[in-house]
């Protein structure tokens, strides 16, 4: 008698290793004999597909060499025209030993930045990934974490993070090891001991001492009044990544001496600077009551920044105020070459107006300081990152006390526009027509940035401005 098909052995989940054989059995009782078709993920498997073998009147489906992509739901459908078609489904789970698909590579990273060593894996069950540093398993902590992807992330890289690393991928079927890679930590040039300022008699010998460190070990050059040192002898020694340089001078004129430590990171250089003044005791004769005088600015560095024919205050505590103040600006100006294009024009305006203050002539010529609000705008909006670095240098004593004009002004100590509109000077317009910006950069990092930061852009303003904040 005709009998509708019945599947007597329903399909079950089959586990198979890659490159092995996997077989699904779909035993059917019926009369007449049924037609049996197979699907994978609801797509019909063709009888002539050479990756499969279909035998026993279609009741056995064999995958001849399992691939990772064979994972899925397999169904057999039996139909003999009597009653309805019947179906049974089962899953194929492809098991796979761990395999490292993206191994880690050698990394050179600057101290304080974030390092990521990749380690992307395949396998089923999903392999767990751990890391070995040197010969020991690597412990995770607040800085060091193994990401979901298996990659190793190290925040705020430290010198002690340097070394040899490998990743290990493990599951129930086996273990895979990556090749050993090297993490090299480079460190910005940093001055450990800055040269000290001296007030000496004419014809004295003075030794200026400058010590710096960094990875690679930096080189030290000396600058005298903005130019390479023309006289004097330099002695250098290097020990434990610390370079020690001594400049011996025969003093015949006052000067500003700068120690510059430089090291290379790929194509980029990092520099650290510290300056000292050499003054000659008899040269400086400030008048008792009068600390300076008003004169038209005749220098070069601040030409583009100060108003034409600006009346500036020249400080007579310097032997040659015009030259000394111009030197201060020149030295500080060179520092600004490394800051971002957003910060530089604002910082230049602040610097020139800070060192060559507007002068109020009268019986006692008086310097007019910058208005507090303008100082804050430069500090917090245009140069937030750079200001932190400058303040850090000032606190660490990399700017000597005699060099107080080189350190950044303390905005809070400057007079406000609200007190007396004539008591403080406004900076020229700070409009550089860059991108639209609307939010402040987070003011947390005190490390110098190698690259100019990407400032956030906004869409809700109808004009272009440059800093990370502009008006209210």
């Amino acid at each position: 008698l005709p009998k509708a098909p019945v599947i007597t052995t329903p399909l079950e989940t089959v586990d198979a290793l890659v490159e092995e054989v996997a077989t699904f059995m779909c035993a059917v009782e019926s009369y007449p004999q049924p037609e049996i078709s197979w699907t994978r993920n609801k797509i019909l498997i063709k009888l002539f597909d050479t990756r499969y073998s279909i035998r026993e009147n279609g009741q056995l489906l064999t995958i001849l060499s399992v691939e990772d992509s064979d994972d899925g739901i397999y169904c057999c459908t039996a139909n003999n025209g009597v009653g309805g078609a019947v179906e049974s489904c089962g899953a194929l789970q492809v098991k796979m030993k761990p395999k490292i698909t993206r191994p880690p590579i050698n990394v050179k990273i600057i101290e304080g930045l974030k390092a990521v060593l990749p380690c992307t894996t395949m396998g089923n069950p999903k392999p767990s990934v751990s890391w070995i540093k040197g010969d020991s398993p690597l412990r995770e902590n607040s800085r060091i974490a193994v990401l979901e992807s298996g990659s190793l992330r190290i925040h705020n890289v430290q010198k002690e993070d340097a070394g040899q690393y490998r990743c290990v991928a493990k599951n129930s079927l086996g273990t895979a090891y990556s090749k050993v890679v090297k993490l090299e930590v480079e460190v910005f040039a940093r001055i450990l001991r800055a040269p000290e300022s001296h007030n000496v008699t004419f014809g004295s010998f003075v030794t200026l001492h400058c010590t710096a460190t960094g990875i690679p070990v930096p080189t030290i050059t000396w600058i005298e009044n903005g130019n390479a040192v023309s006289s004097g002898s330099i002695q250098e020694s290097v020990k434990d990544r610390v370079i020690d340089s001594r400049l011996q001078l025969f003093i015949t004129k006052p000067g500003l001496y700068t120690c510059i430590a430089t090291n290379k990171h790929g194509e980029k250089f990092s520099t650290a600077k510290a300056a000292a003044t050499i003054s000659i005791a008899e040269w400086s004769k400030p008048q008792k009551d009068n600390k300076g005088y008003c004169a038209q600015y005749r220098g070069e560095v601040c030409n583009a920044v100060l108003a034409k024919d600006a009346l500036v205050f020249l400080n007579t505590s310097y032997a040659d105020p015009e030259e000394a103040q111009e030197l201060l600006v020149h030295t500080a100006w060179n520092e600004l070459k490394v800051v971002s294009p957003v910060c530089r024009p604002a910082a230049e305006a602040l610097l020139c107006n800070h060192i060559f203050q507007e002068c109020s002539p009268g019986v006692v010529p008086t310097p007019i300081p910058i208005c507090r609000e303008y100082c804050l705008a430069v500090k917090e909006l245009f140069c937030a990152k750079e200001w932190l670095v400058m303040e850090e240098k000032t606190h660490r004593g990399l700017y000597r006390s005699e060099m107080h004009l080189l350190s950044v002004p303390e905005c809070s100590k400057l007079p406000s526009m609200h007190w007396d509109p004539t008591a403080c000077a406004r900076l020229p317009h700070l409009d550089y027509n860059k991108e639209n910006l609307k939010t402040f950069p987070p003011m947390t990092s005190s490390k110098p940035s190698v690259d100019i930061p990407n400032l956030p852009s906004s869409s809700s303003s109808s004009f272009s401005v440059s800093p990370t904040y502009s008006m209210t």
Epitope: E373, L430, K438, P467, S470, M471, T472
Partner: antibody, heavy 124, light 107 residues
Framework: EVQLVESGGGLVQPGGSLRLSCAAS????????IHWVRQAPGKGLEWVAS????????SYADSVKGRFTISADTSKNTAYLQMNSLRAEDTAVYYC?????????????????WGQGTLVTVSS | DIQMTQSPSSLSASVGDRVTITCRAS??????VAWYQQKPGKAPKLLIY???SLYSGVPSRFSGSRSGTDFTLTISSLQPEDFATYYC?????????FGQGTKVEIK
């Protein structure tokens, strides 16, 4: 003495237009930033728009963008707020206020002088 | 956009009390924060600018301070004329945000 006087408020139907004026004296509009701030009945302060004449730069709150236009006539020392496509939710007292300095520093000086306000009622 | 969350929304205090009102910025901001006093039917008055600078003519019992993203207005000894609504205000890039206001009432 610094003074700001608003005018131009009144009753207008939804979809209608109004132009508010803010006449300044005791300082020059060109050297300051001018702002419009509104206050719906029984509610808090809400910034509407700002202009810095020295730059010809303007900015608007999202709620009014595309409908309101802020401008200034430095020869008349007056700022304006052109309000189009008015809605019931624009009903408020509109204040004009100034802050010292250009757009970068005015945030640090605060809105130091305010007008007495002008009432705008949008209702059918 | 930066939000300024002001707390409390209202408070009751007596003459002579020390009163503290706080504004918390939703993200890192500059010190371009001001505080205003507003009385019913009147325009707001500037009290504090640049987070901590006292505006000219404002009594010294008012002071402002900053700690990270928290800005505080303190009235050291409340006077009868100080009962009003106080607002903080932050200036972003051409974007001004006010706090919701704090109403200081007589206990």
């Amino acid at each position: 003495e610094v003074q700001l006087v608003e005018s131009g408020g009144g009753l207008v139907q939804p979809g209608g237009s109004l132009r508010l004026s803010c006449a300044a004296s005791g300082f020059t509009v060109s050297s300051s930033s001018i702002h419009w701030v509104r206050q719906a009945p029984g509610k808090g302060l809400e910034w509407v728009a700002s202009i810095s004449s020295s730059y010809g730069s303007t900015s608007y709150a999202d709620s009014v963008k595309g409908r309101f236009t802020i401008s200034a006539d430095t020869s008349k020392n007056t700022a304006y707020l052109q309000m189009n496509s008015l809605r019931a939710e624009d009903t408020a007292v509109y204040y004009c206020a100034r802050s010292e300095g250009d757009r970068y520093v005015s945030g640090y000086s605060g809105l130091d002088y305010w007008g007495q306000g002008t009432l705008v009622t949008v209702s059918s | 956009d930066i939000q300024m969350t002001q707390s409390p929304s209202s408070l009751s205090a007596s003459v002579g009390d020390r009163v503290t009102i706080t504004c918390r910025a939703s993200q890192s901001v500059s010190s371009a924060v001001a505080w205003y006093q507003q009385k019913p039917g009147k325009a707001p008055k500037l009290l504090i600018y640049s987070a901590s600078s006292l505006y000219s003519g404002v009594p010294s019992r008012f002071s402002g301070s900053r700690s990270g993203t928290d800005f505080t207005l303190t009235i050291s000894s409340l006077q009868p004329e100080d009962f009003a609504t106080y607002y903080c205000q932050q200036s972003g890039v051409w974007l001004i945000t006010f706090g919701q206001g704090t109403k200081v009432e007589i206990k």
